[in-house]
């Protein structure tokens, strides 16, 4: 009876599998000792014509490694649309804007990045602007979360290496799909899927958490889960199915916060895995991956239990030829507002990327249009004129984009919030009933923050974007809210009040700060107009006194 | 808190069926398992199956094949479990748990099912 | 079906340290679970996955082992605890529980 079986490439609509690594292909990580700038240089390497980007930077909360100015250079190869996320810090950004289109103007100094032809050179230059912290080469990558702050066990020098893992300091997310292999085991009767994942390891042996997300919407009840991986690895498993787990090291599971389950020694070999599945009484292997030393893998299979079938021969077709994509046009067309005026800018050279050819521009009233200046067109209008729609705190228009003849007209609603008009500020509380506002908070008692907007308002939706408490030049910047998600288990994001204030609590821990203190909270929130998805942002502080539980006055 | 308040006792005549209900609370009810288990006197617990209310999936102890049906209704958060074809061997209490990875956390009061003409 | 062997009955005195062993009769992993039954009431989780303390249950409860062989140790007794404990497997179709210790203190 054979054992194995022969594993075949899976059609990619039956599931997909995507991951996070560390590891790039040149990098390093330093410790820019006595720095008041770290300096992040990524190099993206993509090779279509247009790609998109998600880069995120999160701000450090361990202790001594408060951020306190970033430099990043971005050097791309091709053509590539950024989606940007940073936090509320000093940050320059240095890149081609040429190559690099920013989606919605990003809120950060902006350098020119200088006309250098190699590597060498670019890191020159970007070691005038402070001390190089981090270097990574990426090759097509969809999405990059790069940490910011200093990493003590980190060398002095930033030397590059080839394969390099960079820890904690940058993980990102391929664009290639992840092979996907299947196959079935002759002779087992019954229906039970086995999902098998295997760890290639990789260039530096530390412990380290794979977390491994699994969304299975099969209607089958048995399912197998194995996972293996070098020595080092262990595993933090979030999946919707209960099922029989057989790991490698040692695993823990979402669903059962603070367990350890003792991992069991399992053959290095896709056969020998497979003869594993076997014996728990698999019938087929759903999906056998293979993968480099990851962070985070998330497998969802969203036709288990079918009909077993793997992906015919590919064939060669000729892609067509790029030609204008009006979803990327019109996100482009972001509105910015100010001083009762409502502009937009276009760059010619983006629209010229993008191959468009535009003819025109205009609000909805068409004797209104855009002035064509030497890089830009800029539409431009009072929020008296040109059809604008105004209401109490929110302003309206239509820009019409005009083409050469034959293609119809696009048409985007731009609306602004007039900022002018409402008012905000943050509440700190000590219960959760909201009453007594206070600007104390003593060490180990939970904070309860409340966002007020008036006057109160339903055209405008107010969500907390991000928030983090600044304890000052002796403490730590602690993040508190990142991304519109908790960061860690001392804070909770909670249901708004009656009248729709965001609000949350966190509890500081007494290590958090190093003495008693004053800190600043800042939050940025992210506004948007209530009929549509628009954003902009606003940031609110302040001030508060930060006090030992023995100091606090209570008896 | 999480809670599980199961139906009351039932008095039921061989031959016929009996459906009872678990009402969870306290936590999405989608995202766990529903265990169903036997107690009779002096003879232990038996694990009859689990749904899994997210997408309807069932699990059954092969045993109960063709005796219990279990199905769930997230609009009211609510398992059930139907017993057919009743004898006097079905009398027992009827619990529910929730549960993940055939852990029952929380388990309901239990039901009283008495077969008796 | 995987059989689960408990000893039936154990007395012990208040202060004391108790192991209540359960054998499988084939593996089971580490999916090994502990329930504590008082008379009238539903089971109560104690132990999952062999080693695991379950939320609110005090530190006195602990559980080791994997593979065949579990132990649910109680350190020290206390009153209260006498219960009937049962041990349940969910590794191997169908799931199985054992027949119950009776726990009674002296």
């Known amino acids: 009876e054979r054992v194995g079986c022969d594993l075949q490439p899976v059609d990619p609509t039956r599931g997909e599998v995507t991951f996070t690594t560390s590891q790039v292909s040149e990098g390093c990580v330093a410790q820019a000792a006595n720095a008041v700038r770290e300096v992040h240089v990524l190099f993206l390497d993509f090779p279509g014509m247009l790609s998109h980007l998600e880069l995120t930077l999160q701000a450090s909360k361990q202790n001594g490694t408060e951020t306190q100015e970033v430099f990043l250079v971005l050097v791309s190869n091709k053509n590539v649309f950024v989606k940007f996320q940073a936090p509320e810090i000093p940050l320059h950004l240095a890149y081609d804007s040429s190559l690099v289109i920013f989606q919605g103007q990003p809120r950060v100094n902006i350098t020119v990045l200088p006309s250098l032809t190699s590597r060498k050179q670019i890191l020159d230059w970007a070691a005038t602007k402070g001390a190089i912290t981090s270097i990574a080469a990426l090759d097509d990558p969809q999405s990059i979360v790069l940490q910011l702050g200093q990493d003590p066990k980190a060398p002095f020098l930033c030397l590059p290496e080839a394969h390099k893992d960079m820890g904690a300091t940058l993980e990102w997310q391929p664009r290639a799909q992840t092979p996907v292999q299947s196959c079935r085991l002759e002779g087992v009767s019954g229906h039970k899927e086995a999902y098998i994942l295997r760890i290639l390891p990789g260039s530096e042996a530390g412990p380290r958490t794979v977390t491994v997300m699994m969304e299975l919407s099969c209607t089958s009840g048995d399912a197998i889960l194995i996972l293996h991986g070098p020595p080092y690895v262990s595993w933090f498993i979030d999946i919707n199915h209960s099922m029989q787990i057989l790991t490698t090291g040692e695993y823990s599971v979402k669903i059962f916060p603070g367990s350890k389950v003792k991992g069991v020694e399992l053959p290095d070999t896709p056969q020998g895995l497979i003869a594993e599945a076997r014996k728990l009484n698999a019938s087929i292997v759903t999906s056998f991956v293979e993968l480099p030393l990851v962070s985070n893998v998330s497998l969802r299979a969203s036709s288990c239990g079918g009909v077993f079938q793997t992906t015919p021969a590919p064939v060669v077709t000729t892609p067509p030829k790029d030609t204008c994509s009006p979803v990327l046009l019109m996100s482009l067309i972001q509105p910015k507002c100010g001083n009762q005026v409502m502009t937009l800018a276009l760059n010619k050279k983006h629209v010229q990327t993008l191959q468009c050819t535009i003819t025109g521009l205009t609000f909805w009233d068409s004797s209104c249009q855009a002035e064509d200046t030497d890089d830009h067109l800029v539409l431009s209008s009072a929020y008296s004129s040109c059809g604008m729609k105004v209401t109490a705190h929110v302003v309206s228009n239509e820009v019409i984009i005009s083409f050469p003849s034959g293609s119809p007209p696009l048409r985007k609603k731009v609306q602004c919030i007039d900022m002018d008009s409402l008012s905000f500020q943050l509440g700190l509380y000590l219960s959760p009933h909201f009453l007594q506002a206070s600007n104390t908070i003593e060490l180990g008692q939970q904070a309860f923050v409340q966002v007020s907007v008036s006057p109160l308002t339903s055209e405008v939706t107010v969500q907390l974007d991000s928030c983090h408490l600044d304890l000052g030049p002796e403490g730590d910047m602690v993040e508190l809210i990142q991304s519109r998600t908790a960061k860690g288990s001392c804070v909770t994001l909670l249901s708004p009040s009656p009248e729709g204030d965001p609000r949350f609590s966190f509890l500081l821990r007494v290590y958090m700060v190093p003495t008693p203190t004053a800190g600043t909270l800042s939050c940025n929130l992210a506004l948007r107009p209530s009929t549509l998805s628009q954003e902009v942002y606003k940031t609110v502080s302040m001030r508060l006194n930060i006090v030992s539980p023995d100091l606090s006055g209570k008896g | 808190q999480v809670q599980l308040q199961q139906s009351g006792a039932e008095l039921v005549k061989p031959g016929s069926s009996v459906k009872i209900s678990c009402k969870a609370s306290?936590?999405?009810?989608?995202?766990?398992?529903m265990h169903w288990i036997k107690q009779q006197p002096g003879n232990g617990l038996e694990w009859i199956g689990w749904?899994?209310?997210?997408?309807?999936?069932?699990k059954y102890n092969q045993k109960f094949n063709g005796k219990a049906t279990l199905t769930a209704d997230k609009s009211s958060s609510t398992a059930y479990m139907q017993l057919s074809s009743l004898t006097s061997e079905d009398s027992a209490v009827y619990f529910c748990?929730?549960?993940?990875f055939g852990v029952g956390d929380y388990w309901g009061q239990g039901v009283m099912v008495t077969v008796s003409s | 079906d995987t059989v689960l062997t408990q000893s039936p009955a154990l007395a012990v005195s208040p202060g004391e340290r108790v192991s209540i062993s359960c054998r499988a009769s084939?593996?089971?992993?580490?999916?090994m679970h502990w329930y504590q039954q008082k008379p009238g009431q539903q089971p109560k989780l104690l132990i999952y996955i062999a080693s695991n303390l379950a939320s609110g249950v005090p530190a006195r409860f602990s559980g080791s082992g994997s593979g065949t062989d579990f132990t649910l140790t109680i350190d020290p007794v206390e009153a209260d605890d006498t219960a009937t404990y049962f041990c349940?497997?969910?590794?191997?179709?169908?799931?199985?529980f054992g027949a119950g210790t009776k726990l009674e203190l002296k």
């Open positions: 749904i899994y209310p997210g997408n309807g999936n069932t």
């Open positions: 349940q497997q969910s590794w191997n179709d169908p799931y199985t």
């Open positions: 748990a929730r549960g993940k």
């Open positions: 084939e593996g089971v992993n580490s999916y």
């Open positions: 306290g936590y999405t009810f989608t995202s766990y398992d």
